[in-house]
C-alpha cells in the first residue's frame, strides 16, 4: 500500500497492479480509483508537498495525507467514486454531536468477512514519478479524505476543505489488491471492465496475496494526473464551481451526523482529545490514544471508529496495505458493536466499502454496500453507491436494476442518470444513453462531472450524427477532463507535446522508422503468411469501435510484453523489433498487424493515453478508398512508408476499397517521457 505521492497517484492508480503484471488495464479504474484529475495541464504538486494535511478526516492514509491540493484531489477522487458513490457529505461536526439514532439491527458481519477478495496486496507506490497524469477512466476513486465518511463526519473538528481550485498533484496511492473489477473507459468502450491491474510492477512479491500480502516495502510507482480539485468530497463539482443556485447549495449541505451514543457522550472529552491529535496529523499519537480508548472502553463505537480512522490515516501515511486491511476490519468492528448511532454506522460501513474498493476488494465492498442498503433502505445515495459496486465487479445488469430503481423513486437524480446512461452506452443502446448522460451531467450532482461521462456522451452523439458532440467535448475540456476538444484520452501525463501528426524526425525515433521502412516487405510477408496459415491469430476488434465492417488484429507485443506464441508466426519481425526498446518496452501500447476489409468504418474515437505515439507502416494498401483522419487532417497509407500520429487525438478510419488493407502498428513511448516515467507508468 505504499503510497505514492498523492499527487503522483492522483489519476494514476495504475499503480495498483494487483497481479503484479504491470497491467494498467482494467480501467485502471481501480487503480485510478478515482483519481479524478482536473486539468491535464496543471503542474503536479510535488508529492512531498502533498503530505501535510490538515483535514483530519481527510487524513486518510494515502489519500488523506496530501496537502490541500492533494486532499482536494483526493477528495475529488474520493468524491468521484465516493461521489460516485454519492457519498453524502456532511459538514464537519464535532464530536459533540448529539446522540444519533442507533443503527438498525445489524445482520451478522459474516457476510462481510466472507468476501472473496483475496489479493490484498498493496504494492508500494513510489512517489518517484511525478508526471501528472490525468486519467479518467471509470474506476473506483481513490478516496481522499477518509472518505466522505470522514468528511461527512468531520465530526470532530472543524476543518477546512482544501482549496478546490488548486491543482492536484500526483498522488501516491495505495494499491488495490485488485481482486476485482472496475469500470473504465477503455479507449472508446463504455464498459466497466474488470480491473486488470494496471499498474506498476510490484517488486518481490513472493507468495499469493492471500498468504503473503505485499510488504510495505515493496514499491510501486504510479503516474498521476493533476487537476484542481473539482469535486471535493463534501461539495459537488458544480458547487465548487461557485454556484449561487440555492438549490444546489441545499443539495450540498447536510445535517451533521450524530456520531455519539449515550455512553460516548460521557467520554466525549477523551474522544475529543484523541480526535484532536488525529486532526492535527499526529497520526501515531492518535493511533495510540484511540487504541487505548478502545482498550478502556471496548463497547464504545466512537472510540472504535476513531481507531479505524487512525489506522486508515496511518495506512495512507505508510502506504501500507497491511495497515489498511486492519482499518477495514476495524470499521467492521464498529458496525458489530451494540448501540451504534445510525450516522456512525453508515459512515463506518461506507468508509469500509470505499477502502475495500481502494484495495481492489470489489466483492467485499459490494457485500458491505448491500448491507448498507439493507440497513438504510431509504437512502438513495447508498443505492447509487451499490450500483457502482456492481459496476466494479462487471455486473452491469444488477447495476442497471439498481439505477432503474433509484430513478423510479428520484427521477432527477443526476448520479443515477449518468451511470444509467453509461450502462446503456456499454450495452450499445447509443441513442437511449444520450438523454441520461446529458441530463445527468447537466444536473451538476456530485459524481456527475467525470470525464468518462463527457467522453461517452460525446461519442454517443457522434455515432447518431448529433453535432452537439463537440459542445460536450468542449465543456469537458473546459472542466479539465480533456486536454483539448480533440485530445480526449483519459490517462495522461501533463505537459507532453500534443499534436495529431508527427514526422519521424520530430519523434527522434528515426532509426526505428528507417528499420521498419527498410524491412517492410519482410514484415508484410510474415503477416501475410499468418493470414494465410493461421488466420485465427487475427482477432476481431472487440471494443465496439466499428460502425460496420471487418477489422482484425494480430498482436506481437502488448503492455510491453512479448507474445511468444505470436512471435512464432512472425519471428523475423519480432527479432527486428527487439532492437528498439522505445516500442517493445512501451507498456502503454502494442505492436500488431491490423487488417481491415472493404466496407469498414471505424467511428471517431480516442486512445486511452497521451503517453504513446502510434506508427502505421503500410503493408498492403489498396490504391483507393482507405484513409485515416486524426483531428482535422486526413491522410492515406503507402506501402513501405510510416505514418505517425498521436492516437490520444480523435481519429477515424474508412476502408472503402475493393480489397483488404494490411498495416503494421508500432506504438512508441511519447519521446518527451523521461526514462523514469517510462519505467514507472502503469501499463495500459
Amino acid at each position: 500500500f505504499d503510497l505514492v505521492d498523492y499527487e503522483e497517484v492522483l489519476g494514476k492508480l495504475g499503480i495498483y497492479d494487483a497481479d503484479g503484471d504491470g497491467d494498467f488495464d482494467v480501467d485502471d479504474a481501480k487503480v485510478l480509483l478515482g483519481l479524478k484529475e482536473r486539468s491535464t495541464s496543471e503542474p503536479a504538486v510535488p508529492p512531498e508537498e502533498a503530505e501535510p494535511h490538515t483535514e483530519p478526516e481527510e487524513q486518510v492514509p494515502v489519500e488523506a495525507e496530501p496537502q490541500n491540493i492533494e486532499d482536494e484531489a483526493k477528495e475529488q477522487i474520493q468524491s468521484l467514486l465516493h461521489e460516485m458513490v454519492h457519498a453524502e457529505h456532511v459538514e464537519g461536526e464535532d464530536l459533540q454531536q448529539e446522540d444519533g439514532p442507533t443503527g438498525e439491527p445489524q445482520q451478522e458481519d459474516d457476510e462481510f468477512l466472507m468476501a472473496t477478495d483475496v489479493d490484498d496486496r498493496f504494492e508500494t507506490l513510489e512517489p518517484e514519478v511525478s508526471h501528472e497524469e490525468t486519467e479518467h477512466s471509470y474506476h473506483v476513486e481513490e478516496t481522499v479524505s477518509q472518505d466522505c465518511n470522514q468528511d461527512m463526519e468531520e465530526m470532530m473538528s472543524e476543518q477546512e476543505n482544501p482549496d478546490s481550485s488548486e491543482p492536484v498533484v500526483e498522488d501516491e496511492r495505495l494499491h488495490h489488491d485488485t481482486d476485482d473489477v472496475t469500470y473504465q473507459v477503455y479507449e472508446e468502450q463504455a464498459v466497466y471492465e474488470p480491473l486488470e491491474n494496471e499498474g506498476i510492477e510490484i517488486t518481490e512479491v513472493t507468495a499469493p496475496p492471500e498468504d503473503n500480502p505485499v510488504e510495505d516495502s515493496q514499491v510501486i510507482v504510479e503516474e498521476v494526473s493533476i487537476f484542481p480539485v473539482e469535486e471535493q468530497q463534501e461539495v459537488p463539482p458544480e458547487t465548487n464551481r461557485k454556484t449561487d443556485d440555492p438549490e444546489q447549495k441545499a443539495k450540498v449541505k447536510k445535517k451533521k451526523p450524530k456520531l455519539l451514543n449515550k455512553f460516548d457522550k460521557t467520554i466525549k472529552a477523551e474522544l475529543d482529545a484523541a480526535e484532536k491529535l488525529r486532526k492535527r496529523g499526529k497520526i501515531e499519537e492518535a493511533v495510540n490514544a484511540f487504541k487505548e480508548l478502545v482498550r478502556k472502553y471496548p463497547q464504545s463505537p466512537r472510540a472504535r471508529y476513531g481507531k479505524a480512522q487512525c489506522e486508515d490515516d496511518l495506512a495512507e501515511k505508510r502506504r501500507s496495505n497491511e495497515v489498511l486491511r486492519g482499518a477495514i476490519e476495524t470499521y467492521q468492528e464498529v458496525a458489530s458493536l451494540p448501540d451504534v448511532p445510525a450516522d456512525l454506522l453508515k459512515l463506518s460501513l461506507k468508509r469500509r466499502s470505499d477502502r475495500q474498493q481502494f484495495l481492489g476488494h470489489m466483492r467485499g465492498s459490494l457485500l458491505t454496500l448491500q448491507r448498507l442498503v439493507q440497513l438504510f433502505p431509504n437512502d438513495t445515495s447508498l443505492k447509487n453507491d451499490l450500483g457502482v459496486g456492481y459496476l466494479l465487479i462487471g455486473d452491469n445488469d444488477n447495476a442497471k436494476k439498481v439505477y432503474e430503481e433509484v430513478l423510479s423513486v428520484t427521477p432527477n437524480d443526476g448520479f443515477a442518470k449518468v451511470h444509467y446512461g453509461f450502462i446503456l452506452k456499454a450495452q450499445n443502446k447509443i441513442a437511449e444513453s444520450i438523454p441520461y448522460l446529458k441530463e445527468g451531467i447537466e444536473s451538476g450532482d456530485p459524481g456527475t462531472d467525470d470525464g468518462r461521462f463527457y467522453f461517452h456522451l460525446g461519442d454517443a452523439m457522434q455515432r447518431v450524427g448529433n453535432k452537439e458532440a463537440y459542445k460536450w467535448y468542449e465543456l469537458g475540456h473546459k472542466r479539465g477532463h480533456f486536454a483539448s476538444v480533440w485530445q480526449r484520452s483519459l490517462y495522461n501525463v501533463n505537459g507532453l507535446k500534443a499534436q495529431p501528426w508527427w514526422t519521424p524526425k520530430e519523434t527522434g525515433y528515426t532509426e526505428l522508422v528507417k528499420s521498419l521502412e527498410r524491412n517492410w516487405k519482410l514484415i508484410r510477408d510474415e503477416g501475410l503468411a499468418v493470414m494465410d496459415k493461421a488466420k485465427g491469430l487475427f482477432l476481431p476488434e472487440d471494443e465496439n469501435l466499428r460502425e460496420k465492417g471487418d477489422w482484425s488484429q494480430f498482436t506481437l507485443w502488448q503492455q510491453g510484453r512479448r507474445n511468444e506464441n505470436a512471435c512464432k508466426g512472425a519471428p523475423k519481425t519480432c527479432t527486428l523489433l527487439e532492437k528498439f526498446p522505445e516500442t517493445t518496452g512501451c507498456r502503454r501500447g502494442q505492436i500488431k498487424y491490423s487488417i481491415m476489409h472493404p466496407g469498414t468504418h471505424v467511428w471517431p474515437h480516442t486512445g486511452p493515453t497521451n503517453c504513446r505515439l502510434r506508427m502505421h507502416l503500410g503493408l498492403v494498401i489498396p490504391k483507393e478508398g482507405c484513409k485515416i483522419r486524426c483531428a482535422n487532417e486526413t491522410k492515406t497509407w503507402e506501402e513501405g512508408k510510416v505514418l505517425i500520429f498521436d492516437d490520444s487525438f480523435e481519429h477515424e478510419v474508412w476502408q472503402d476499397a475493393s480489397s483488404f488493407r494490411l498495416i503494421f502498428i508500432v506504438d512508441v513511448w511519447h519521446p518527451e517521457l523521461t526514462p523514469q516515467q517510462r519505467r514507472s507508468l502503469p501499463a495500459i
Partner: antibody
C-alpha cells in the same frame, strides 16, 4: 533495532516482594504499550499485565490483580513490574514485551527473567 | 474471558510435510486480534502471524494463517528442521489478552 533488556530475577519467599525492570532501546518507547507475560516452568505463556503508552491505563490478569503493579518511566525508557504478596504459583520466567503500534499483538520480547517463589 | 484452545497438543511430523495447527476461541474473536507465535526451547517467543493472516517481518512464506470468528489455523506448508517448536495463538479482547495452551510440533 528493538532491544528489551530485563533485570536479573531471583528467589523470593512467599509473601515477599520483588520488582522487575525492563530497559528499552531502539525505538520510541513512549509510543508503545508494554506488556509482561510469564511462563511457568514447562508450561505455556500467560499474559500478566499491560500498560498504555503514556502510563495512564493499566490492565491485569485476574490472578495478579491487587498484588502486581505495572508502571513505566518514559524518561528512562524503562518498564517495571512490582510484584507483592508473591505466591509459589507466581514462579515463572517473566517476559517484558512490546505491543505493536497499531495492533494488539506483541512484536518484540525481552530475554526473560526467572522469578522463583519458594520458602 | 475468551479461552483459546489449541489442537492438537502435540503434532508429530517429518521435515517436508505440511503442518496444520488449530486454535479455537470460546467466543468470536476479531481476526485483527489473533496472532501466532513460535517458541523454541530456551528462547523468547517470536511473532509469526498477526491479524490472523499477515506474516510478520522476516517470516518465511511457508507460514500462513487463516480463519475468522472462532476458528483459526496456522499452516506450515513444508516443514523445515528449524520449524519444530511450540506454537501459541493469542487474542486480545476487552483489555484482556489470552494465549492458547500451545501445540508442540515435534519430529516424527
Amino acid at each position: 533495532q528493538v532491544q528489551l533488556v530485563q533485570s536479573e530475577g531471583g528467589v523470593v519467599q512467599p509473601g515477599r516482594s520483588l520488582r522487575l525492570s525492563c530497559a528499552a532501546s531502539g525505538f520510541t518507547f513512549n509510543d508503545y504499550a508494554m506488556h509482561w507475560v510469564r511462563q511457568a516452568p514447562g508450561k505455556g505463556l500467560e499474559w500478566v499485565a499491560v500498560i498504555s503508552y503514556d502510563g495512564s491505563n493499566k490492565y491485569y490478569t485476574d490472578s495478579v490483580k491487587g498484588r502486581f503493579t505495572i508502571s513505566r518511566d518514559n524518561s528512562k525508557n524503562t518498564l517495571y513490574l512490582q510484584m507483592d504478596s508473591l505466591r509459589p504459583e507466581d514462579t515463572a520466567l517473566y517476559y517484558c514485551a512490546r505491543e505493536a503500534s497499531s495492533g494488539w499483538y506483541i512484536d518484540s520480547w525481552g530475554q526473560g527473567t526467572l522469578v522463583t517463589v519458594s520458602s | 474471558e475468551i479461552v483459546l484452545t489449541q489442537s492438537p497438543g502435540t503434532l508429530s511430523l517429518s521435515p517436508g510435510e505440511r503442518a496444520t495447527l488449530s486454535c479455537r476461541a470460546s467466543q468470536s474473536v476479531s481476526s485483527s486480534y489473533l496472532a501466532w507465535y513460535q517458541q523454541k526451547p530456551g528462547q523468547a517467543p517470536r511473532l509469526l502471524i498477526y491479524g490472523a493472516s499477515s506474516r510478520a517481518t522476516g517470516i518465511p512464506d511457508r507460514f500462513s494463517g487463516s480463519g475468522s470468528g472462532t476458528d483459526f489455523t496456522l499452516t506450515i506448508s513444508r516443514l523445515e528442521p528449524e520449524d519444530f517448536a511450540v506454537y501459541y495463538c493469542q487474542q486480545y479482547g476487552s483489555s484482556q489478552v489470552t494465549f492458547g495452551q500451545g501445540t508442540r510440533l515435534e519430529v516424527k
